[in-house]
C-alpha cells in the first residue's frame, strides 16, 4: 500500500481467483484513544472499533472511503483504491490503447517546435467518475523540471455505438534549451483513477521525436505567363522555432484533386515556393517537416488551383 | 576552417557535408525510429556519446558570440562516431553489406572532422569507451542505439552550419 | 493488368512526318498523364513531354517544342505523338508512359523503334 | 536544366557482389529523384522514387539514399537478372532530365 495523496492509498493486488488479497492497517488520524468506531462509504454498519482497523482487502467491494467516527463525529477519512495486476501486469483498463506508432500506446505526445513545450493526449470510453493527475521531468534518476497544466476533456467522438473521450494535458520544461541535443527523455506519468480502480500511464521521448510542425501559413498562388504551371508560395507557421536559418524546415507540395485516387503532381523542397502544374478542380496542398530530423510531417495546408 | 587559432571554417562546404550526413544517418537505419530503444537500458551504452549540450554555445546567440567553442564540441562528436562507425560493433558480425551508407557515413563524418580541423591542429578529441559486445544480437542493437544518437548529434551540426552558411559567413 | 500497346517499327524518309500511337488497356487514359520518351541507340533517355488527356493541356521539353506534337483519343483511349521534319537525329526508340503521377514514369509501352532514312 | 551525372559508366561484377550506383545532379533537387532499370531490348522499369521510396513488386535487394546533389542506388547482392543499365532521373524543375546511365555488366 502507498499514499497517492493525502488520505488517498493505492493498494496493489494480484489479480487472480480465490487470491488472499492484502492485509491494511488503517490508523484514525486522531489524538483519540477509545471510543473510535470504522464504517465503510455511505454504510452506518460498524465494522470495527480502535484507533486502527485491520482488513483484508480483496475486491474492489474492500475498496472505497472509511471513515473513523467519535461519538457521531468524524474524526478522519482513508480513500482505499485498487491497482490490478494480472499475471504480472498491470492493468490497463481505463484508457485506449492507440495503437499508434505501436500497440500498447496509451499517451500519446507531440511538439510543435523545440520550445520545450509539449501536449500530450489520451482516449477513454469512460465519461463519469474518472479522475487523471499528470507528472513530468526530463530524466528519471535526476529528474528536471517539467509543469503540467491540469488534463482536460479535448474532444467527444462516437466510434460506433460507444462515445469516446479525448483528454490532453500540456506540459513546459522548465529550463528548455531548444538547440542542445537532448541525451535525457522526458518522463510522463498519468495517475488515472475511475471510481475505486487506479491505474498509471507513462510514455518517455525526446522532444525531437515528438515534433510536428504546424502546417505552413499564407499560402499563395501566382500563373506563370503562357503556361498551365503556377508558383505556389508560402511561409513557416508562426510556431516554429526560431531562427528559421538555424531551425530549417522541408516541405512537400501536392497538387491533387478531390479522391486520393486521382493524378497528382508533387515535389519536394527546401525552399518556401514551388513550381507546379495547376488542374480545374485540383488544390495544392504543402506540408513540412524538420529538415535534418525525420520526425512528422505536419498536417497538409491548401488552397483550391483555381 | 575552424582551426584552434579562431579562424572561420568553410560554412557552405560544412552545410552540405552536414546535411549529407544527416541523410545517410536516416538511409543507414531508416526503421530505427519504429524500434523503443529505451526499453533495452541505455544507459551503459550510449551515455558515454559526446552529447552537444546547453552550455556548449551552439545555439544562435553562441555561434555570433564565439563559434569556436561549438565548432570544437562537434569536432570532438565527429571523431568519436568515426571511431565508432570503424570499431569492432560495425565491422563485426553480423557483417554490413559493402554498399551499405553506413560506409559512406563514416567517410563523411572524417570528412567534416577534416574540414573542420586541418592536418596540424589538434583540438582534444574525447577517449571512446571500450565497448566490445560479445554476441552478434549485441552488436546489432548496439548499432541501432549509436546510429540513434548519431542521427540526433548531426541534426544539430547541420542546424549549426547552415545557420553558420547563412549568416556567419564572409 | 495495366498495359500500353504502341505502334509497330516505322521506315520514313527524311523531311517526312510520322505519328506513334499508344493504346491503353486496364485502365482509363482520362485518369493518368501520358508521357513519350525517346531513346536513341546505344543512348540515354530524353523526356520528350506529357499530355493530360483529361483536358489536352501539354508540357514539352524545349527541345521538342515545334519538333513534336502530342495529341490524346479518350474515346479510344489512345495517346499520338507526331514527329515532324524528321532528319537522322530521330531516329531513335520512342516510349509512351503512364503514369498518375506527373514527374516520374511508371508504365512503360514497349516503344517505338522510329529509323529515318536520307 | 538540370545535369545529372552517373558514375560509373560501366560496372563490371560477379553476381552475388554489392554494388553502389551514383547519380550527382548539377543543382540541389531535394529528393527529386528516381532510378529505373532498362534490361537489354526491354522498356524502362522504376525501381525507387523520391531518392529511397521502394515500389511494390521490386524486390527488396534494391534501395536508395541521398538528398541535394549525392544519390545512391544500391544493389545487395547482385543476381544475373540484375544486369543492364540503370538510369536516375530528377523531378526538380522541367525538362524532367535522365542522366546518362550506367551499364552493369558481367565480370
Known amino acids: 500500500i502507498w499514499e497517492l495523496k493525502k488520505d488517498v492509498y493505492v493498494v496493489e493486488l494480484d489479480w487472480y481467483p480465490d487470491a488472499p488479497g492484502e492485509m491494511v492497517v488503517l490508523t484514525c488520524d486522531t489524538p483519540e484513544e477509545d471510543g473510535i468506531t470504522w464504517t465503510l462509504d455511505q454504510s452506518s454498519e460498524v465494522l470495527g472499533s480502535g484507533k486502527t482497523l485491520t482488513i483484508q482487502v480483496k475486491e474492489f467491494g474492500d475498496a472505497g472511503q472509511y471513515t473513523c467516527h467519535k461519538g457521531g463525529e468524524v474524526l478522519s477519512h482513508s480513500l482505499l483504491l485498487l491497482h490490478k495486476k494480472e499475471d504480472g501486469i498491470w492493468s490497463t483498463d481505463i484508457l485506449k490503447d492507440q495503437k499508434e506508432p505501436k500497440n500498447k500506446t496509451f499517451l500519446r505526445c507531440e511538439a510543435k517546435n523545440y520550445s520545450g513545450r509539449f501536449t500530450c493526449w489520451w482516449l477513454t470510453t469512460i465519461s463519469t467518475d474518472l479522475t487523471f493527475s499528470v507528472k513530468s521531468s526530463r530524466g528519471s534518476s535526476d529528474p528536471q523540471g517539467v509543469t503540467c497544466g491540469a488534463a482536460t476533456l479535448s474532444a467527444e467522438r462516437v466510434r460506433g455505438d460507444n462515445k469516446e473521450y479525448e483528454y490532453s494535458v500540456e506540459c513546459q520544461e522548465d529550463s528548455a534549451c531548444p538547440a542542445a541535443e537532448e541525451s535525457l527523455p522526458i518522463e510522463v506519468m498519468v495517475d488515472a483513477v475511475h471510481k475505486l480502480k487506479y491505474e498509471n500511464y507513462t510514455s518517455s521521448f525526446f522532444i525531437r521525436d515528438i515534433i510536428k510542425p504546424d502546417p505552413p501559413k499564407n499560402l499563395q498562388l501566382k500563373p506563370l505567363k503562357n503556361s498551365r504551371q503556377v508558383e505556389v508560395s508560402w511561409e513557416y507557421p508562426d510556431t516554429w522555432s526560431t531562427p528559421h536559418s538555424y531551425f530549417s524546415l522541408t516541405f512537400c507540395v501536392q497538387v491533387q484533386g478531390k479522391s486520393k485516387r486521382e493524378k497528382k503532381d508533387r515535389v519536394f523542397t527546401d525552399k518556401t515556393s514551388a513550381t507546379v502544374i495547376c488542374r480545374k478542380n485540383a488544390s495544392i496542398s504543402v506540408r513540412a517537416q524538420d529538415r535534418y530530423y525525420s520526425s512528422s510531417w505536419s498536417e497538409w495546408a491548401s488552397v483550391p488551383c483555381s | 576552417r575552424a582551426v584552434p587559432g579562431g579562424s572561420s571554417p568553410a560554412w557552405t562546404q560544412c552545410q552540405q557535408l552536414s546535411q549529407k550526413l544527416c541523410t545517410l544517418a536516416w538511409s543507414a537505419h531508416p526503421l530505427v525510429g519504429h524500434m523503443d530503444l529505451r526499453e533495452e537500458g541505455d544507459e551503459e551504452t550510449t551515455n558515454d556519446v559526446p552529447h552537444i549540450q546547453c552550455g556548449d554555445g551552439c545555439d544562435p546567440q553562441g555561434l555570433r558570440d564565439n563559434s569556436q567553442f561549438c565548432l570544437q564540441r562537434i569536432h570532438q562528436g565527429l571523431i568519436f562516431y568515426e571511431k565508432l562507425l570503424g570499431s569492432d560493433i560495425f565491422t563485426g558480425e553480423p557483417s554490413l553489406l559493402p554498399d551499405s551508407p553506413v560506409g559512406q557515413l563514416h567517410a563523411s563524418l572524417l570528412g567534416l572532422s577534416q574540414l573542420l580541423q586541418p592536418e596540424g591542429h589538434h583540438w582534444e578529441t574525447q577517449q571512446i569507451p571500450s565497448l566490445s559486445p560479445s554476441q552478434p544480437w549485441q552488436r546489432l542493437l548496439l548499432r541501432f542505439k549509436i546510429l540513434r544518437s548519431l542521427q540526433a548529434f548531426v541534426a544539430v551540426a547541420a542546424r549549426v552550419f547552415a545557420h553558420g552558411a547563412a549568416t556567419l559567413s564572409p | 493488368e495495366v498495359q500500353l500497346q504502341q505502334s509497330g517499327a516505322d521506315l520514313v524518309r527524311s523531311g517526312a512526318s510520322i505519328k506513334l500511337s499508344c493504346t491503353a488497356s486496364?485502365?482509363?487514359?482520362?485518369?493518368?498523364?501520358m508521357h513519350w520518351v525517346k531513346q536513341r541507340p546505344e543512348q540515354g533517355l530524353e523526356w520528350i513531354g506529357w499530355?493530360?488527356?483529361?483536358?489536352?493541356?501539354?508540357e514539352y521539353a524545349p527541345k521538342f517544342q515545334g519538333k513534336a506534337t502530342m495529341t490524346a483519343d479518350t474515346s479510344s483511349n489512345t495517346a499520338y505523338l507526331q514527329l515532324s521534319s524528321l532528319t537522322s537525329e530521330d531516329t531513335a526508340v520512342y516510349y509512351c508512359?503512364?503514369?498518375?503521377?506527373?514527374?516520374?514514369?511508371?508504365?512503360w509501352g514497349a516503344g517505338t523503334t522510329v529509323t529515318v532514312s536520307s | 536544366d538540370i545535369v545529372l551525372t552517373q558514375s560509373p559508366a560501366t560496372l563490371s561484377v560477379t553476381p552475388g557482389d554489392s554494388v553502389s550506383l551514383s547519380c550527382r545532379a548539377s543543382?540541389?533537387?531535394?529528393?527529386?529523384l528516381h532510378w529505373y532499370q532498362q534490361k537489354s531490348h526491354e522498356s524502362p522499369r522504376l525501381l525507387i522514387k523520391?531518392?529511397?521510396q521502394s515500389i511494390s513488386g521490386i524486390p527488396s535487394r534494391f534501395s536508395g539514399y541521398g538528398s541535394g546533389t549525392d544519390f545512391t542506388l544500391s544493389i545487395n547482392s547482385v543476381e544475373t537478372e540484375d544486369f543492364g543499365r540503370y538510369f536516375c532521373?530528377?523531378?526538380?524543375?522541367?525538362?524532367?532530365?535522365f542522366g546518362a546511365g550506367t551499364k552493369l555488366e558481367l565480370k
Open positions: 499530355i493530360d488527356p483529361e483536358n489536352g493541356d501539354t
Open positions: 508512359n503512364a503514369h498518375k503521377e506527373l514527374r516520374y514514369f511508371d508504365v
Open positions: 543543382q540541389s533537387i531535394s529528393i527529386n
Open positions: 523520391f531518392a529511397s
Open positions: 532521373q530528377q523531378s526538380n524543375s522541367w525538362p524532367l532530365t
Open positions: 486496364g485502365f482509363n487514359i482520362k485518369d493518368y498523364y
